[in-house]
């Protein structure tokens, strides 16, 4: 147990105010009650506390709710969220978008990242969803935060609100999360002509499958090299020659920068040299010439299958 | 279940001491605010005393403060009030109760034990 | 301190009839913190209403509360023959917790 302080007479705290930044760390200790800070949350932010009178005030509200901050306190931490942990936020149940609009203002230039992913984790578990309120509060308080959703939170997404989603809103999108939200994008923009489909799409393709870059590539879309190097990797590989270079129209000449990175690397090591040499761009690595191209995964599925056999 | 059972009432004389215990079980005591509430024969409630789980902070009501003392025991469960200097309007049962913060209410009471302050 | 002020006294009803029973604050109180106990001859007080309107585990549903502010009300939609006892109300901030006196609910 915290040794215990009594606190002096002439500093007990009846409301909280500003002559509580005069008082020591053990003095806050003592003489605020917890429920009276609870309930007087929307005070603290305006009284400039040091980040040590801050973390009393915090050990307060622990002490006080153990099982996790309401939301009627929540809502109102100002500064003091920065105090907080993910471990703590994971406690939390927060359905209103005014307190994530206003815990998301807060965490503003600081190095929030994690507490702001457990944040919006905790928004979506309150609400049920990812609904369109959610996405668009995020998107403009919040851009790239998308993505700092678990794929199992993406998973709840309507494919409704995918339209609300901006380009920029996906930068920071790995590949598992993409995974969930591809098949989304492509049902809310399935009535959309091919152009119009492509410019929508793009920016979710890094979750495609071959099938639907094939596809893609007999539209005439012109992808950008930036878009083909987000691709998955397993989806590039089996792409012909002849698909890359409709797919990427063009912007075909831009594999020779890229051929060194992944997944433009992985496909060449893949195609024969004589394929790439249609390119003309000087390509290098490929099967040569009177090769014999064995699919390894099918080589390893017939030998598995005598084994057991 | 939630458990709270008061202990150490009796007859006192004015100006005397008497320390009550509260044991508590059922919840994780170490967590929970923890309150004592007083009740004149054939009167109305009233609060004595508070104390936090941690930094055992402790709040009393003016009526009181100075002559008792709210502590707590987190190893053994145990809620205590130490009074001292009692007096014949101190006669009253003696409530342990358990301060949810989430409700802000007392939302569990022990039975209660009696004190008695009489020459 | 916050005085909290219950009306009437006495209530004598009838099983059955409905029951209102009120509690004035002398100051403003959020109702977050206004809580609502019954409590029976002999018996220590229970828990019924929190944060003014929530009914608290295990508290039939002929029980509400309401109000904010300076006013708040406990309502017994049909009293039962367990319901006659006394009420108080009660605020839990700022300190001191206060108590109102009390109000009797009896059998008319």
């Known amino acids: 147990d915290v040794e215990r302080t009594t606190c002096p007479p002439e500093k007990e705290v009846h409301e909280i105010d500003e002559s509580l930044i005069f008082y020591k760390k053990r003095e806050l200790e003592a003489c605020v009650d917890a429920a009276l800070l609870a309930a007087q949350m929307d005070r603290v932010d305006a009284i400039p506390f040091t980040y040590e009178q801050l973390d009393v005030l915090k050990h307060k509200l622990d002490e006080l709710y153990p099982q996790g901050y309401p939301e009627s306190v929540i809502r109102h931490l100002g500064h003091l969220f920065l105090k907080m942990s993910p471990e703590d936020i994971r406690k939390w149940n927060v359905t209103s978008l005014e307190t994530l609009k206003a815990l998301l203002k807060v965490s503003k230039g600081h190095e929030m990242s994690a507490q702001v992913a457990t944040l919006i984790d905790r928004v979506v578990v309150g609400r049920g969803q990812l609904d369109k309120d959610t996405a668009d509060t995020l998107t403009a308080f919040c851009p790239g935060c998308l993505c700092s959703l678990s794929p199992e939170r993406l998973s709840s997404v309507p494919p409704s609100i995918i339209g609300a989603v901006r380009p920029q809103d996906l930068d920071t999108c790995g590949p598992r999360q993409l995974d969930v939200l591809y098949p989304k994008a492509r049902l809310a923009f399935q009535n959309m002509s091919g152009s119009e489909y492509f410019v929508k799409i793009r920016p979710f393709l890094g979750g495609a499958p071959t099938e639907d870059l094939k596809a893609l590539s007999q539209q005439n879309v012109s992808m950008d090299l930036a878009t083909f190097m987000k691709l998955r990797r397993e989806a590039v590989l089996p792409l012909s020659v002849a698909e890359v270079q409709k797919l990427l129209g063009p912007h075909v000449e831009g594999l020779k920068v890229e051929e060194q990175h992944s997944p433009v690397r992985d496909w060449i090591l893949k195609q024969r040299q004589d394929d790439l040499d249609t390119l003309g761009l000087g390509l290098q690595g490929g099967i040569p010439n009177g090769y014999l191209i064995l699919d390894l995964s099918v080589r390893e599925a017939l030998s598995h299958h005598h084994h057991h056999h | 279940e939630v458990q709270l059972l008061e202990s150490g009432g009796g007859l006192v004389q004015p100006g005397g001491s008497l320390r009550l215990s509260c044991a508590a079980s059922?919840?994780?005591?170490?967590?929970?605010?923890m309150s004592w509430v007083r009740q004149a024969p054939g009167k109305g409630l009233e609060w004595v005393s508070n104390?936090?789980?941690?930094?055992?902070?402790?709040n009393y009501a003016d009526s009181v403060k100075g002559r008792f003392t709210i502590s707590r025991d987190n190893n053994k469960n145990t809620l205590y009030l130490q009074m001292n200097s009692l007096r014949a309007e101190d006669t009253a049962v003696y409530y342990c109760?358990?301060?949810?913060?989430?409700?802000?209410?007392?939302?569990?009471w022990g039975q209660g034990t009696l004190v008695t302050v009489s020459s | 301190e916050i005085v909290l002020t219950q009306s009437p006294g006495t209530l004598s009803l009838s099983p059955g009839e409905r029951a209102t029973l009120s509690c004035r604050a002398s100051?403003?109180?959020?109702?977050?913190?206004l809580a609502w106990y019954q409590q029976k001859p002999g018996q220590a007080p229970r828990l019924l209403i929190y944060?003014?309107?929530s009914r608290a585990t295990g508290i039939p549903d002929r029980f509400s509360g309401s109000g904010s502010g300076t006013d708040f009300t406990l309502t017994i939609s049909r009293l039962e023959p367990e319901d006659f006892a006394v009420y108080y109300c009660?605020?839990?901030?700022?300190?001191?917790?206060?108590f109102g006196q009390g109000t009797k609910v009896e059998i008319k």
């Open positions: 109760a358990r301060y949810n913060a989430y409700h802000a209410a007392l939302d569990y």
């Open positions: 944060g003014a309107s």
């Open positions: 100051q403003s109180v959020s109702s977050s913190y």
């Open positions: 104390i936090s789980p941690t930094y055992s902070t402790t």
């Open positions: 009660q605020q839990t901030v700022p300190y001191p917790y206060t």
């Open positions: 059922g919840f994780t005591f170490t967590h929970t605010y």
